[in-house]
Interface confidence: low
């Protein structure tokens, strides 16, 4: 037989909390246990499931777990079945809801002196106890003509008056817990004695010296008081006006009139209505003084015929916002057509040359009017007045190439030389009329030149060839003073160029003929063997038919070129001793000797007491020091040539004699001993 050791029993449970219905059986064979709810088998879910033979609830649900539970045990072998006693939950719960108007049927029907009933839709088990609040303050039974039933969920206001106006809320509690209304109810009952707005003042914008009117009206029973205040809380009445509001008038209907408005009158005006009861009602309005700023300047505009262009007029800052319109020749532009106004823009569709001229943007508001002109030019393609022509320009002189064009606007002219853009520098200058000036024409300026004249409408171009008329000149000019080495072969070149190849010849300056050992070979004067008599003045003459002749004078000097008789040698000297560096040179004219030591010329007048240069050119240095070491260069020069030779000077410490060295042993290097 199946015996229930533990049977489920009815019990209290809390909504959403855990619970357990126990069931334990004893039987000889295998027993299958399951549960019924109101006679129907219970299916396991994550929330409600069998645990052994008991039924476990993870979270009791007042809707799904209401009813009668029964534990059923069945012996699958014998078919015997036993059922437990019935068990159910007494589920405790509470759930928030809104405050709603129960009576009258709609808010529109609420009138002073009528009964108003509000219902608190908080539900629960066991039945909750309710508490009502107005504007957060608890209400008690019989308070200020309310009839409040705590047991019931209704709040009755009998009769309802303006003093009952406010935000109503409710809270409720029971054995489960507490909840407050999810949505509250605002009760608004008008009080005839409260000031109510009939007409509110509006912001106004007025021009200086004009008048401004603010309207303001309230209603109440009995009639309310009305007062005007200016920004600084100064009251405005017809009897006592503040100094800056001398021209203010308050009318019986509440309107405020300000005449001859000044900047100091601008600001916030407050109209205050006060009923017999209730708070003051404050209305604000601002008086703005109209203003308009200047308009920005327009840049002149250049357009091309046939195109569509727009010119935007930026309205000046102003209060109120200025209106904008365009005029041309004193006539306001239409809003459609070929030339028209669109918003703030001037639109020129398919521009014609006749559209050129002055267009005016106007802006105006209460404060006044502003205008700004824009000059519109319709560009034309340039036409020629004078094209550049092939020209012959003289070398060394300025040359001009003309490129004269006319168009609207004034064309821009650029020049190209061999397809390269000419940028203005010291040799090239482009005048305002387009003419190109080449300063100091050079042979290589002979090439192609092209000028391009442009406007936004298009460009024209033409080119011309420049031929440079070369001047007769020596290339290069002979040196005016030259030296020849005595008893040697010598040549003196002379060459020249011109429009025609020039003939070149040499002659002596005194007009005498050249000796037979001197030949003139195509401009080169050749001396087979220079003699003293060859010295003198010579003239190179270059000539051609069209340009005549030019002369270059050369003074030839015959000289014996410099040679060194004595050259300085590599020298080593003991510190504190005297060094002698010898140098002698010969030549005609007699050469002068200079010394260079350690990369600087030794000035004989600034040598100091330790150094001296002899007449024959030798350099002596007394009391030598290590810093005197270095390379010394002897430089010999005359009017015809210059030669140099160098030698190093070493300054060393005097060695202490060693015993191994015999007396009078020579030093290991060549010394000057003094």
């Amino acid at each position: 037989a199946i015996v229930f050791i533990k049977q489920p029993s009815s019990q209290d449970a809390l909504q959403g909390r855990r619970a357990l219905l126990r069931c334990e059986v004893e039987a000889p064979g295998l027993v299958h246990v399951y549960w019924l709810l109101d006679g129907a088998p219970v299916q396991d879910t994550e929330r409600r499931f069998t645990q052994g033979s008991s039924l476990s609830f993870a979270a009791v649900d007042r809707l799904q777990d209401s009813g009668t539970f029964q534990c059923v045990a069945r012996d699958d072998v014998t078919g015997e079945e036993a059922r437990s006693a019935n068990a159910s939950f007494n589920i405790k719960w509470i759930e928030a809801g809104p405050v709603v108007l129960k009576h009258p049927a709609s808010e529109a029907e609420i009138q002073p002196q009528t009964q108003v009933t509000l219902r608190c839709h908080i539900d629960g088990h066991p039945r909750p106890t309710y508490q009502w609040f107005r504007d957060g303050t608890p209400l008690s039974d019989g308070q200020s003509n309310n009839t409040v039933s705590s047991k019931e969920r209704n709040l009755t206001l009998r009769p309802a008056g303006p003093e009952h106006s406010g935000l109503y809320s409710c809270c409720a509690h029971n054995a489960f817990g507490q909840a407050c209304s999810s949505q509250n109810f605002t009760l608004s009952i008008a009080d005839e004695s409260f000031a109510r707005v009939v007409l509110a003042p509006q912001d106004v914008i007025v021009a200086r010296n004009e008048e401004a009117m603010f309207h303001c009206q309230f209603s109440a029973q009995p009639p309310p008081n009305l007062q005007w205040l200016f920004e600084d809380e100064t009251p405005i009445t017809n009897r006592s006006r503040p100094p800056h509001l001398r021209r203010a008038t308050v009318f019986a209907n509440g309107s405020l009139l300000l005449t001859q408005v000044r900047p100091r009158n601008a600001g916030v005006y407050r109209c205050i209505g006060q009923g017999q009861r209730g708070p003051p009602v404050i209305l604000e309005a601002t008086l703005h003084l109209a203003e308009i700023e200047d308009m920005p300047l327009f840049e002149p505009r250049v357009f091309t015929a046939g195109s569509e262009e727009r010119v935007t007029c930026l309205p000046p800052k102003g209060l109120p916002e200025p209106s904008v319109w365009w005029e041309h020749a004193g006539v306001r532009l239409p809003t459609h057509g070929r030339v028209y106004q669109k918003g703030h823009e001037l639109v020129l569709a398919s521009i014609a040359e006749s559209d050129a001229g002055v267009y005016t943007c106007h802006a105006a508001n209460l404060a006044g009017q502003r205008r700004q002109d824009v000059n519109i030019t319709v560009a034309t393609v340039p036409t020629w007045l004078k094209k550049p022509q092939d020209s012959q320009l003289e070398e060394g002189k300025p040359g001009y190439l003309h490129c004269l064009t006319q168009a609207t606007p004034k064309p821009t002219v650029v020049w190209y030389r061999n397809q390269m853009l000419i940028s203005e520098d010291s040799r090239f200058e482009v005048f305002k009329n387009g003419t190109l000036r080449i300063n100091n024409v050079e042979v290589y300026d002979g090439t192609w030149y092209r000028c391009v004249s442009s406007t936004p409408a298009g460009s024209i171009e033409a080119q011309a060839r420049v031929q440079v008329l070369e001047k007769l000149k020596f290339t290069p000019p002979p040196q005016p003073q030259q030296c020849m080495e005595f008893d040697k072969e010598a040549t003196v070149p002379c060459s020249a160029t011109g429009r025609e190849k020039p003939t070149i010849k040499w002659e002596r300056a005194d007009g005498s003929s050249l000796p037979e050992w001197v030949t003139d070979n195509a401009g080169t004067l050749h001396f087979a063997r220079v003699t003293r008599d060859d010295a003198g003045n010579y003239t190179c003459i270059a000539s051609n038919g069209p340009q005549g002749q030019i002369r270059a004078h050369v003074q030839l000097t015959v000289a014996v070129f410099i040679t060194f008789k004595v050259e300085p040698e590599r020298t080593t000297v003991y510190q504190g001793h005297t060094a002698l560096l010898q140098c002698e040179a010969q030549g005609d004219p007699k050469p002068l000797i200079q010394w260079k030591g350690k990369d600087r010329i030794l000035d004989p007048t600034k040598l100091g007491p330790r150094m001296h240069i002899f007449q024959n050119g030798s350099l002596v240095i007394h009391d030598v020091a290590p810093e005197d070491s270095g390379r010394y260069t002897c430089i010999a020069g005359n009017s015809c040539n210059i030669k140099h030779t160098e030698a190093p000077l070493y300054v060393v410490d005097k060695p202490v004699p060693e015993e191994s060295e015999g007396p009078g042993s020579p030093p290991p290097y060549k010394m000057i001993q003094t």
Partner: nanobody, 124 residues
Framework: QVQLQESGGGLVQPGGSLTLACAAS????????MRWVRQAPGKGLEGVSS????????YYADFAKGRFTISRDNAKNTLYLQLNSLKTEDTAMYYC?????????????????VGQGTQVTVSS
Amino acid sequence: QVQLQESGGGLVQPGGSLTLACAASGFAFSSYAMRWVRQAPGKGLEGVSSISAGGDETYYADFAKGRFTISRDNAKNTLYLQLNSLKTEDTAMYYCAKGDRNSPRYSSWPITPVGQGTQVTVSS
């Protein structure tokens, strides 16, 4: 001394793209409108596009509209021209040019000084 150095040209097939750049020095680049001009073989200079000093206004010749884009980087003193959907008739030497301080739109073409130019060749 105003110096303008163009780069970025080259040989490209019809329908291809290139970006030209122009490095500017010797003047207050960010205060001036800038423009691109071009010269086709055997033809005169023609305006391509221009841009205001701040880069907020751009203008294009009819042939350039929808295909070319002008821009500038005032921090790098550099002007750019993006060439898309290139045609054989776009073959030309492209120069960048300094405009004036005011309108990028209405100054006359061409504007000097200009640089040495960069060659754009469109050929199949």
